[in-house]
């Protein structure tokens, strides 16, 4: 089926991975489709097979090299096409001239750890993963803390408008279990979006000292 609503979205992780999602209403689950990448100034071509992730969407990763290798730059253009098999031939279902540094989505931050915890505050640090050195300090972060009895969606967002890989959470309740997540976004790129949220870090504040005001 080709008359359904289609969407083709790809992001570059700033190092060696382009991740793509192709969705099409009314498409058959067993349709064989792939993403083909044709760079304008590189010697390689790359293809990945689109695999189903839901009823009407497929995803794949174009792995361009070792995870931390810088495979594309701000001047690269990669023509990306969705090709689906129709009988004996491949049909172009979507096409774009992909500018990697206009379409960034970094990997989720990793290595979250509690640096110091008290009754009312907690200092947490993290690291960014597979992020290009091109960004220098031009990154921002969002963080959120899950309190007891609340959902992640209810958690207020804390914005860090600079490359700061730590946060000091204040006004916490003593002897209480919390969870914390962080995500990162480069300042560069018209279609750039937030990374996925990090894996949650669970921590517990210290109990208040007996006989003292809290």
């Amino acid at each position: 089926a080709v008359n359904g609503t289609s969407q083709f979205t790809c992001f570059y992780n700033s190092r060696a991975n382009i991740s793509c999602v192709w969705s099409q209403d009314g498409a058959l689950q067993d349709t064989s489709c792939q993403v083909h990448a044709w760079p304008d100034r590189r010697r390689w071509n790359q293809t990945c097979e689109l695999l189903p992730v839901s009823q009407a969407s497929w995803a794949c990763n174009l792995i361009l090299g070792a995870p931390d290798s810088q495979k594309l730059t701000t001047v690269d253009i990669v023509t990306l096409r969705v090709l689906c098999r129709e009988g004996v031939r491949w049909r172009v279902m979507a096409i774009q001239d992909f500018k990697p540094f206009e379409n960034l989505r970094l990997m989720a931050p990793i290595s979250l750890q509690v640096v110091h915890v008290e009754t009312h505050r907690c200092n947490i640090s993290w690291e960014i993963s597979q992020a290009s050195h091109y960004f220098e300090r031009h990154l921002e972060f969002e963080a959120r803390t899950l309190s007891p009895g609340h959902t992640w969606e209810e958690a207020p967002l804390l914005t860090l408008k600079q490359k700061q890989e730590w946060i000091c959470l204040e006004t916490l309740t003593p002897d209480t279990q919390y969870e914390f997540q962080v995500r990162v976004k480069p300042l560069q790129g018209e279609f750039t979006t937030w990374s996925p949220w990090s894996q949650p870090l669970a921590f517990r504040t210290k109990p208040a000292a007996l006989g003292k005001d809290t």
């Epitope: 979507a94 018209e190 279609f191």
Partner: nanobody, 126 residues
Framework: QVQLVESGGGLVQPGGSLGLSCAAS????????MSWVRQAPGKGLEWVSS????????HYADSVKGRFTISRDNAKNTLYLQMNSLKPEDTAVYYC???????????????????RGPGTQVTVSS
């Protein structure tokens, strides 16, 4: 704000040629796919041709394939349509259109545009 302004239309004899231009402003031109569509008198909009942001991919309606060429000059923020071997049935108002993203979908190329210019009249007649 996004602005698209077509030019180059006119009266031409069958078999003749004409070149249309579309000057774009108000957006990062080379980040977006573009297209040409046309509307003949008393008819609906008909998709003519599409081009990717860097001009590396192009598609054409069967009715114009081999006669029309779409191109773009990103340094000048301008989209072009070179029309050769014109026929009376090419008579229409020609519009340039901006897609809402860098992607277009060849099976349904008329879908996904968000801005269109005021158009330029092309008349093919002897």
């Amino acid at each position: 704000q996004v602005q698209l302004v077509e030019s180059g239309g006119g009266l031409v004899q069958p078999g003749g040629s004409l070149g249309l231009s579309c000057a774009a402003s108000g957006f990062t031109f080379d980040n977006y796919a573009m297209s040409w569509v046309r509307q003949a008198p008393g008819k609906g909009l008909e998709w003519v041709s599409s081009i990717t942001g860097a001009g590396r991919g192009t598609h054409y309606a069967d009715s114009v394939k081999g006669r029309f060429t779409i191109s773009r000059d990103n340094a000048k923020n301008t989209l072009y349509l070179q029309m050769n071997s014109l026929k009376p049935e090419d008579t229409a108002v020609y519009y340039c259109a901006k897609y809402s993203s860098s992607t277009y979908y060849p099976p349904t190329p008329a879908r996904g545009t968000d801005y269109r210019g005021p158009g330029t009249q092309v008349t093919v007649s002897s």
